[in-house]
Interface confidence: medium
């Protein structure tokens, strides 16, 4: 239904607290360099304006679209051009082009320092003094670093953050209570960020149809007892919600997400038997719970997939009459039978089925032609299964850090032109798949591994797109989203790469490494490892092991020395010389 004032409508639906949080996220995602204080001033102005519109929907400017209102606010910021350069050019455009222009200037890798968590005592003091401001800073800092973070989900994580601080700040050992709990929230939020970026990439590059196919597969796995029409309705709604959030329509997105949760809870009987526990929760938790819901039990009486899609004489007629619906039912029927497959794999199978029908339905004897299609799925299914098996075995053998290093070597050999920080970030994230997925029951491993890897590789593609340096990466990233992971897996050592000159300064370390937290220490070592591979792309595993072992011993020895600086200064050049020799 149409509302006189869109902003008043959203304010009433969302309530003041969520409204303000979402406006702050929107501004932080658009203008990523602005300080919190500047954004919060704008948020207050927008909120005050929304309240005037709630009081009188006919008040001046209340009929303007939210994009117009937000865009006008952003464009009124003084010194916009000084701080944002060509983003200021967007302000010369009219809506909707202006908003499109803002979206194009979102930076996936903003030049911002890593978010440093304050020391526990200081954190609790500022939280207790002003919880609203503290959580506002959290929203601002996360949103500006992750300009596509799913806004309603970020509100949920802020709520979690609030819960943890409320609980831990009353404890005697605040740090012991806070650290593991906040680490868990951070880990979940970072995974959520890459997953959502993948959804927005899918939407931007391949459109709503591709995203909807993803949603149909995912919903069918989760709700195998729901009718196809019900799954289609849910997938359509989820597609709309994600399109809104990816497009910067955060108020509408959050409002529609709450509506979908309400619908699902009112229609549990026709969706899933597992929803009740979620439906008793408040709105943010309810939506999050529904998004993470376990799969319902598969109905016992499902006929063979072959009956409808291979053996039936009317396959080509049904396909010709309503291609999307027929392929949709295939995807639904296959997905609801296979919660043990990744969504990427299910979409590959649907694509293979579609290609088979396109070819066979144009031939003289279609049934003979498409009769073997299900058997032809076998290699497509085996490939990711083998990937999971070999990688989980390697992870179990090496542990997370060792596995990350193995992945780093592999990916540096595949794409040595990519910047070392990007390779290290990607390898560290890819390497976490072991901890995240390899400990799960067999039936959950494949979907966990492949869908997580796809999201991480999407991040690599997004960063590479900004400054393309590797033809191989460009090739894998330009193709279909579901083929990306197999494409990267199939890459071998880049034979066209001219090895990097050996620069001693790249491998020169100082005593400051000793005081770094473990994570930063690992990153330093992994940076050195990537640089070694760039210098010697064909170095054997043993050679790399020797050099890295030597390096670890060197760091360990010098960090224990009485005169650390002197140790690094004298032992460093010896290490460099030995490394060059070992790799010769």
């Amino acid at each position: 239904e149409a509302h006189k004032s869109e902003i008043a409508h959203r304010f009433k639906d969302l309530g003041e607290q969520h409204f303000k949080g979402l406006v702050l996220i929107a501004f932080s995602q658009y203008l990523q360099k602005c300080p919190y204080e500047e954004h919060i001033k704008l948020v207050q102005e927008v909120t005050d304006f929304a309240k005037t519109c709630v009081a009188d929907e006919n008040a001046e400017n209340c009929d303007k679209s939210i994009h117009t209102l937000f865009g006008d606010k952003l464009c009124a910021i003084p010194k916009l051009r000084d701080n944002y350069g060509e983003l200021a050019d967007c302000c010369a455009k009219q809506e909707p082009e202006r908003n499109e222009c803002f979206l194009q200037h979102k930076d996936d890798n903003p030049n911002l320092p890593p978010f440093q968590r304050p020391e526990a005592e200081a954190m609790c003091t500022s939280f207790q003094e002003n919880p609203t401001s503290f959580l506002g800073h959290y929203l601002h800092e996360v949103a500006r670093r992750h300009p596509y973070f799913y806004a309603p989900e970020l509100l949920y994580y802020a709520e979690k953050y609030n819960e943890v601080l409320t609980q831990c700040c009353t404890e005697s050992d605040k740090a012991a209570c806070l650290t593991p709990k906040l680490d868990a929230v951070k880990e979940k939020a970072l995974v959520a960020a890459v997953r959502q970026r993948m959804k927005c990439s899918s939407m931007q590059r391949f459109g709503e149809r591709a995203f909807k196919a993803w949603a149909v597969a995912r919903m069918s796995q989760r709700f195998p007892n729901a009718e196809f029409a019900e799954i289609t309705k849910l997938a359509t709604d989820v597609t709309k919600i994600n399109k809104e959030c990816c497009h910067g329509d955060l108020l509408e997105c959050a409002d529609d997400r709450a509506e979908l949760a309400k619908y699902m809870c009112e229609n549990q009987a026709t969706i899933s038997s597992k929803l009740q526990a979620c439906c008793d929760k408040p709105v943010l938790q309810k939506s999050q719970c529904l998004a993470e819901i376990e799969h319902d039990n598969i109905p016992a009486d499902l006929p063979s997939i072959a009956a409808d899609f291979v053996e039936d004489k009317e396959v080509c007629k049904n396909y010709a009459e309503a291609k999307d619906v027929f392929l949709g039912t295939f995807l639904y029927e296959y997905s609801r039978r296979h919660p043990d497959y990744s969504v990427s794999l299910l979409l590959r199978l649907a694509k293979k089925y579609e290609a088979t029908l396109e070819k066979c339905c144009a031939e003289g004897d279609p049934p003979a032609c498409y009769g073997t299609v299900l058997a032809e799925f076998q290699p497509l299914v085996e490939e990711p299964k083998n990937l999971v098996k070999t990688n989980c075995e390697l992870y179990e053998k090496l542990g997370e850090y060792g596995f990350q290093n193995a992945v780093l070597v592999r990916y540096t050999q595949k794409a040595p032109q990519v910047s070392t920080p990007t390779l290290v970030e990607a390898a560290r994230n890819l390497g976490r798949v072991g901890t995240k997925c390899c400990t799960l029951p067999e039936a959950q491993r494949l979907p966990c591994v492949e869908d997580y890897l796809s999201a991480i590789l999407n991040r690599l593609c997004v960063l590479h797109e900004k400054t393309p340096v590797s033809e191989k990466v460009t090739k894998c990233c330009s193709g279909s989203l579901v083929e990306r992971r197999p494409c990267f897996s199939a890459l071998t050592v880049d034979e066209t790469y001219v090895p990097k000159e050996f620069k001693a300064e790249t491998f020169t370390f100082h005593s400051d490494i000793c005081t770094l937290p473990d994570k930063e220490k690992q990153i330093k070592k992994q940076t050195a490892l990537a640089e070694l591979v760039k210098h010697k792309p064909k170095a054997t595993e043993d050679q790399l092991k020797t050099v890295m072992g030597d390096f670890a011993q060197f760091v360990d020895k010098c960090c224990k020395a009485a005169d650390k600086d002197n140790c690094f200064a004298t032992e460093g050049p010896n290490l460099v010389a030995r490394s060059k020799e070992a790799l010769a």
């Epitope: 009718e227 289609t232 109905p299 009956a307 039936d312 009317e314 049904n318």
Partner: nanobody, 124 residues
Framework: EVQLLESGGGLVQPGGSLRLSCAAS????????MVWVRQAPGKGLEWVSM????????YYADSVKGRFTISRDNSKNTLYLQMNSLRAEDTAVYYC?????????????????WGQGTLVTVSS
């Protein structure tokens, strides 16, 4: 707005045949499974037959198995019920309905839109 319009009912002698039709509009017909349900005078509702979106799965109540055939034509947005070897106990108002949820074991079946029904009378 969703509309279902049944036709084809009438008076027929035992052993005779009838073909019921149901014209659907206001929704994407091929997305939905469809059913025929009937209500005999003074009795409750009884489901008769169900058909999947593309017509390749059909289910029948034991009382009509082997005598009735359900079919659909998605290009015409129409559902059919061919009724042969009719008996006096088949006398009822026949409704077509759009399936909202279907559990084959019978635990969960809901229909969200119905037609106004067509009367079938089997009598000599």
């Amino acid at each position: 707005e969703v509309q279902l319009l049944e036709s084809g009912g009438g008076l027929v002698q035992p052993g005779g045949s009838l073909r019921l039709s149901c014209a659907a509009s206001g929704f994407t017909f091929s997305l939905y499974r469809m059913v025929w349900v009937r209500q005999a005078p003074g009795k409750g509702l009884e489901w008769v037959s169900m058909i999947s979106q593309f017509g390749n799965q059909t289910y029948y109540a034991d009382s009509v198995k082997g005598r009735f055939t359900i079919s659909r034509d998605n290009s015409k947005n129409t559902l059919y019920l061919q009724m042969n070897s009719l008996r006096a106990e088949d006398t009822a108002v026949y409704y077509c309905a759009k399936v909202r949820s279907w559990d084959q074991t019978g635990g969960r079946r809901t229909f969200d839109y119905w037609g106004q029904g067509t009367l079938v009378t089997v009598s000599s």
